[in-house]
C-alpha cells in the first residue's frame, strides 16, 4: 500500500502530527494529488545534486499539469484552482533553487515513514501508551496460556496415573506376600501345582504390567518437565524480560509498564505445577521402597528426576523475584533512578509465585553495592550505606492487589565518608553523575524442605548529594536505560555505547509526553535533530555519542544539548503547561522555517518558540509585521526566562504584549496564533478577570483605588532591524478606568498625557539574547 | 474415567463355546462381566479381582463360564462353555478401581463407582 494511503488510516494523535508536516513551502494538497508519483522519486539524492534537482522539479511541474487536465476533463473548479495556485507558488520559490522543494519533500516523505514506524510499534505493544494495564493477549500470549494449561493437565493427568500404579504395586505386593506367606511357591506338590502356577504366572503379569506403569510414568515426567522447561523459558526469558524492559522504557518516561497479574498468575501457576510434580516424584521413591527389581525404571530415573524439578523450581523462584518499582524519591516521581543522599527514597519488591503459605515468611534485606568489591571499575567510585528501615517482611495485605510484596518507604542514602572527599580513592575515572550503584534485596526461602536463596536488584542509580546534579543524573538514567537491557552493567559509563538519532528522538519526545499531555511532533524532532547533527535531511539511523548528547557544548554555545533541552522541560512543566498542552507553543523550529511559515501570513500572525540561546530555559513569540514600505517583517522579542514568568503567566504577557512606536503610541502586534487563532480565543481563558486582580477597594479611602496594569512593552524605532529580537520592557503602572487603558495614548485625553511621559519603564524582562 | 470397549458377541448354536474380550484404559482393581436380556434387569455374571485371583460367578454360570485377566493388555475375557439360549442378553464389561468384588458387586449392592461399556450382543439359537 501506498504511504500515503498507509498514512490516511493513522488515528487522529498522528493525523495532527502530519498536519503539522506540511505548510505552503510543500502544499498537502500537493501530496494528495501526485501521492503515486511523489514516492517514487529519490528525493534525497535530488536534494544532494543540483542538477537533478532540476531535472525532478521540471517533472513534477511536468506532473502538475497532467493532473490539471484530469480535473479539468472532471470539470472540478476547486482542484483546478488549488493546482494552478500551487504551480504558480513553486514556480516562483523553487525555480531558481530546485533543491530547496527536493529537501523539503525528502525530509516529509522520511518524517512520514517514522510517523508510520511509531504508529506500527504503539500497535504492536497493544495500545499500551492508552491502556497500561489492558488486558492485551497477544498470540504468543495465548500459547503460553496452553502450553500452562497442557502442563497442569499433564501433571492432573499423571496424578491419576500414580494412584493407578499404586493400585497395581499394592495388588502385587498383596499377591506376591499372600503366596508367599501359604508356601504355595515352594509347594508344587500333587493338585495344587497347576493352580500356583497359574497364580505365578498371573504374579508375573503383574509386574510386566506394574514395569510397563512405572516406565511409562517415568516417561511421561521426563516429558512434562521437558514442557515446563519450555513454558518457564518463555516465562522468564521473554515475558518478564519483555516486562523488564519495558519497565526500563516507563522509568525514562515511555508508555506506562502493563501491571504483573497475568505474569504471577502464570508464574504461580507454573510454580503449582512444578511443587505438585514434585511431590509425584517423592511418591516414586516411597514406591520404589516399597517394591523393587531388577531394572527398576525408578531406581534408574528418579534421581535425575529430582534433580530436575527442584532446579527447576529454584531457578522459577528466583526469577519471580522482582522489583515492582524501582528507587525513586518521593518528591521527583517522574525522575526514578536518581537519589539523593539525605533525602528518602522507596522502592517495592515482589514475589511473583503467590503461595499464601509464604505470607509474613520472607525477610528481605536491603543493601547497595553488595558487589562492588568485585568491579575493576569502581575503584574510585564512593561508597554508600542504606539507612532507614532497610529489613521488611513480606506479606499480601500492604498491596491492594493481594500480591506478595514488600515496600520500603522510609530508604535514605549516606556517603561514607573517606580521607580525599568522599572518593575512595583519587584515580575516579568516572563524573558522580555517571557513577551507577545498584540498590541489592535478599531474601531466603524455606519451602517443603527446600532452601532457596533470592537476591534481585534495582536498575542502576545514580546518586547525587545536590540537587543541582539532577539534570546530568538523569540524562545517565535516559541513555542507560535506552541503549542496554542488561540489568547491572554498572561499568557503562567507563565506554558509553553510541544511541541513534531514532532512539534518542523517541526517549526526547517522551520527557514531555510522560509529565505533560503533548509529546514532541515530528517536525519539533527534526529542529532538535538539527541541534545535535546539523543540518540535514534524514537522520534516521544517526549516531549519537554519550559526550555529544550531554557533556560537549552546542556550537557556538556554553552548554550542552541536554542541558539547554533540561531547562525547556522544567520551563514547560512549571510555567507553561497548559499553553503546552494545547499545542499552541511550536516550541522547537529553525530560524528558516519560521521565516517560510510566518512569511506568507497577514501581519500579526504569531508563534511561540523556545530561545536556542538560553542556558536556563527561555520562551520568546515571534510576529509578523510590515514595515513602513509595506514590506513583510518577521520579528522575536527577548526570551522570557523562567525569572519574569515567576511574576506574570506568558499568557498574560501574551495578551498585553505591546510596542511602542515611535510617535509613543501602544500597538499590540500579537493577533493571531499561528495559523489562525483569535489571541483571545487562544489566550484569554489563562488570564485572570481584570475584576479580580483588585477585589477589594480599602474600606477606609473615600474613592476606589485606580487600577493598575502590568503589561510588557517594546519601545521601537523605524531603524528597528529585522530579526533583531526586540527587549521587553515592563511598563510598570498603566492605569485604567473602565476598559479605555490597554489603548492608552497622548492623545486620549490631558491626564493620559502626563501619564504617558511619567511612565517607569523597570528592568528588562529578560536579559539573555536570543 | 476408565474406557471399556467390549468386542467377541455373536449368534452362537445353543452348546457351543464364545469368548468375550474387554480392554480397559487403564488398570482397576477389578473388572467382571454383566448382561441383561430383553425386559429384564441387568445382573452381574463373572467378576474377578486382583487380589488373590479368585473369580467369583453368578450361581447360573458356575463351571460353565470362566473368566480371566491379562494385566499387561489391562484386559478381561469371558470364556462362555456350553451356551444356553437363557444365556443370549447384551454382555457389558465393568470395572471399579476397588480390588473387592465378590457377590456384593455382583449383586450390584457394592458401593463405589462402577464404568461401563457399551456392551456386545450374544444371541442363541436352539
Known amino acids: 500500500m501506498a504511504q500515503w494511503n498507509q498514512l490516511q488510516q493513522l488515528d487522529t494523535r498522528y493525523l495532527e502530527q502530519l498536519h503539522q508536516l506540511y505548510s505552503d513551502s510543500f502544499p498537502m494538497e500537493l501530496r494528495q494529488f501526485l501521492a503515486p508519483w511523489i514516492e517514487s522519486q529519490d528525493w534525497a539524492y535530488a536534494a544532494s545534486k543540483e542538477s537533478h534537482a532540476t531535472l525532478v522539479f521540471h517533472n513534477l511541474l511536468g506532473e502538475i499539469d497532467q493532473q490539471y487536465s484530469r480535473f479539468l476533463q472532471e470539470s472540478n473548479v476547486l482542484y483546478q484552482h488549488n493546482l494552478r495556485r500551487i504551480k504558480q507558488f513553486l514556480q516562483s520559490r523553487y525555480l531558481e533553487k530546485p533543491m530547496e522543494i527536493a529537501r523539503i519533500v525528502a525530509r516529509c516523505l522520511w518524517e512520514e515513514s517514522r510517523l508510520l514506524q511509531t504508529a506500527a510499534t504503539a500497535a504492536q505493544q497493544g495500545g499500551q501508551a492508552n491502556h497500561p494495564t489492558a488486558a492485551v493477549v497477544t498470540e504468543k500470549q495465548q500459547m503460553l496460556e496452553q502450553h500452562l494449561q497442557d502442563v497442569r493437565k499433564r501433571v492432573q493427568d499423571l496424578e491419576q496415573k500414580m494412584k493407578v500404579v499404586e493400585n497395581l504395586q499394592d495388588d502385587f505386593d498383596f499377591n506376591y506376600k499372600t503366596l508367599k506367606s501359604q508356601g504355595d511357591m515352594q509347594d508344587l506338590n500333587g493338585n495344587n501345582q497347576s493352580v500356583t502356577r497359574q497364580k505365578m504366572q498371573q504374579l508375573e503379569q503383574m509386574l510386566t504390567a506394574l514395569d510397563q506403569m512405572r516406565r511409562s510414568i517415568v516417561s511421561e515426567l521426563a516429558g512434562l518437565l521437558s514442557a515446563m522447561e519450555y513454558v518457564q523459558k518463555t516465562l522468564t526469558d521473554e515475558e518478564l524480560a519483555d516486562w523488564k524492559r519495558r519497565q526500563q522504557i516507563a522509568c525514562i518516561g515511555g508508555p506506562p509498564n502493563i501491571c504483573l497479574d497475568r505474569l504471577e498468575n502464570w508464574i504461580t501457576s507454573l510454580a503449582e505445577s512444578q511443587l505438585q510434580t514434585r511431590q509425584q516424584i517423592k511418591k516414586l521413591e516411597e514406591l520404589q521402597q516399597k517394591v523393587s527389581y531388577k531394572g527398576d525404571p525408578i531406581v534408574q530415573h528418579r534421581p535425575m528426576l529430582e534433580e530436575r524439578i527442584v532446579e527447576l523450581f529454584r531457578n522459577l523462584m528466583k526469577s519471580a523475584f522482582v522489583v515492582e518499582r524501582q528507587p525513586c524519591m518521593p518528591m521527583h516521581p517522574d525522575r526514578p533512578l536518581v537519589i539523593k543522599t539525605g533525602v528518602q527514597f522507596t522502592t517495592k519488591v515482589r514475589l511473583l509465585v503467590k503461595f499464601p503459605e509464604l505470607n509474613y515468611q520472607l525477610k528481605i534485606k536491603v543493601c547497595i553495592d553488595k558487589d562492588s568489591g568485585d568491579v575493576a571499575a569502581l575503584r574510585g567510585s564512593r561508597k554508600f550505606n542504606i539507612l532507614g528501615t532497610n529489613t521488611k517482611v513480606m506479606n499480601m495485605e500492604e498491596s491492594n492487589n493481594g500480591s506478595l510484596s514488600a515496600e520500603f518507604k522510609h530508604l535514605t542514602l549516606r556517603e561514607q565518608r573517606c580521607g580525599n572527599g568522599g572518593r575512595a580513592n583519587c584515580d575516579a575515572s568516572l563524573i558522580v553523575t555517571e557513577e551507577l550503584h545498584l540498590i541489592t534485596f535478599e531474601t531466603e526461602v524455606y519451602h517443603q524442605g527446600l532452601k532457596i536463596d533470592l537476591e534481585t536488584h534495582s536498575l542502576p542509580v545514580v546518586v547525587i548529594s545536590n540537587i543541582c546534579q539532577m539534570p546530568n543524573a538523569w540524562a545517565s538514567i535516559l541513555w542507560y536505560n535506552m541503549l542496554t537491557n542488561n540489568p547491572k552493567n554498572v561499568n557503562f559509563f567507563t565506554k558509553p555505547p553510541i544511541g541513534t538519532w531514532d532512539q534518542v528522538a523517541e526517549v526526547l519526545s517522551w520527557q514531555f509526553s510522560s509529565t505533560t499531555k503533548r509529546g514532541l511532533s515530528i517536525e519539533q524532532l527534526t529542529t532538535l535533530a538539527e541541534k545535535l547533527l546539523g543540518p540535514g535531511v534524514n537522520y534516521s539511523g544517526c549516531q549519537i555519542t554519550w559526550a555529544k548528547f550531554c557533556k560537549e557544548n552546542m556550537a557556538g554555545k556554553g552548554f550542552s544539548f541536554w542541558v539547554w533541552l533540561d531547562n525547556i522541560i522544567d520551563l514547560v512543566k512549571k510555567y507553561i503547561l497548559a499553553l503546552w498542552n494545547e499545542g499552541y507553543i511550536m516550541g522547537f523550529i529553525s530560524k528558516e522555517r519560521e521565516r517560510a511559515i510566518l512569511s506568507t501570513k497577514p501581519p500579526g500572525t504569531f508563534l511561540l518558540r523556545f530561545s536556542e540561546s538560553s542556558k536556563e530555559g527561555g520562551v520568546t513569540f515571534t510576529w509578523v509585521e510590515k514595515d513602513i514600505s509595506g514590506k513583510t517583517q518577521i520579528q522575536s522579542v527577548e526570551p522570557y526566562t523562567k525569572q519574569q514568568l515567576n511574576n506574570m503567566s506568558f499568557a498574560e504577557i501574551i495578551m498585553g504584549y505591546k510596542i511602542m512606536d515611535a510617535t509613543n503610541i501602544l500597538v499590540s502586534p500579537l493577533v493571531y496564533l499561528y495559523p489562525d487563532i483569535p489571541k483571545e480565543e487562544a489566550f484569554g481563558k489563562y488570564c485572570r478577570p481584570e475584576s479580580q486582580e483588585h477585589p477589594e477597594a480599602d474600606p477606609g479611602s473615600a474613592a476606589p483605588y485606580l487600577k493598575t496594569k502590568f503589561i510588557c512593552v517594546t519601545p521601537t524605532t523605524c531603524s528597528n532591524t529585522i530579526d533583531l529580537p526586540m527587549s521587553p520592557r515592563t511598563l510598570d503602572s498603566l492605569m485604567q478606568f473602565g476598559n479605555n487603558g490597554e489603548g492608552a495614548e497622548p492623545s486620549a485625553g490631558g491626564q493620559f498625557e502626563s501619564l504617558t511621559f511619567d511612565m517607569e519603564l523597570t528592568s528588562e524582562c529578560a536579559t539573555s539574547p536570543m | 474415567d476408565v474406557q471399556l470397549v467390549e468386542s467377541g458377541g455373536g449368534s452362537v448354536q445353543a452348546g457351543d463355546s464364545l469368548r468375550l474380550s474387554c480392554v480397559a484404559s487403564?488398570?482397576?482393581?477389578?473388572m467382571g462381566w454383566f448382561r441383561q436380556a430383553p425386559g429384564k434387569e441387568r445382573e452381574g455374571v463373572a467378576a474377578l479381582s486382583s487380589r488373590g485371583f479368585a473369580g467369583h460367578y453368578t450361581d447360573s454360570v458356575k463351571g460353565r463360564f470362566s473368566i480371566s485377566r491379562d494385566y499387561v493388555k489391562n484386559a478381561v475375557y469371558l470364556q462362555m462353555n456350553t451356551v444356553k439360549p437363557e444365556d443370549a442378553a447384551m454382555y457389558y464389561c465393568?470395572?471399579?478401581?476397588?480390588?473387592?468384588?465378590?457377590?456384593?458387586?455382583?449383586?450390584?449392592?457394592?458401593?463405589?463407582?462402577?464404568?461401563w461399556g457399551q456392551g456386545t450382543l450374544v444371541t442363541v439359537s436352539s
Open positions: 465393568a470395572a471399579r478401581e476397588g480390588w473387592e468384588c465378590g457377590e456384593t458387586w455382583l449383586d450390584r449392592t457394592a458401593g463405589g463407582h462402577t464404568y
Open positions: 487403564t488398570y482397576t482393581g477389578c
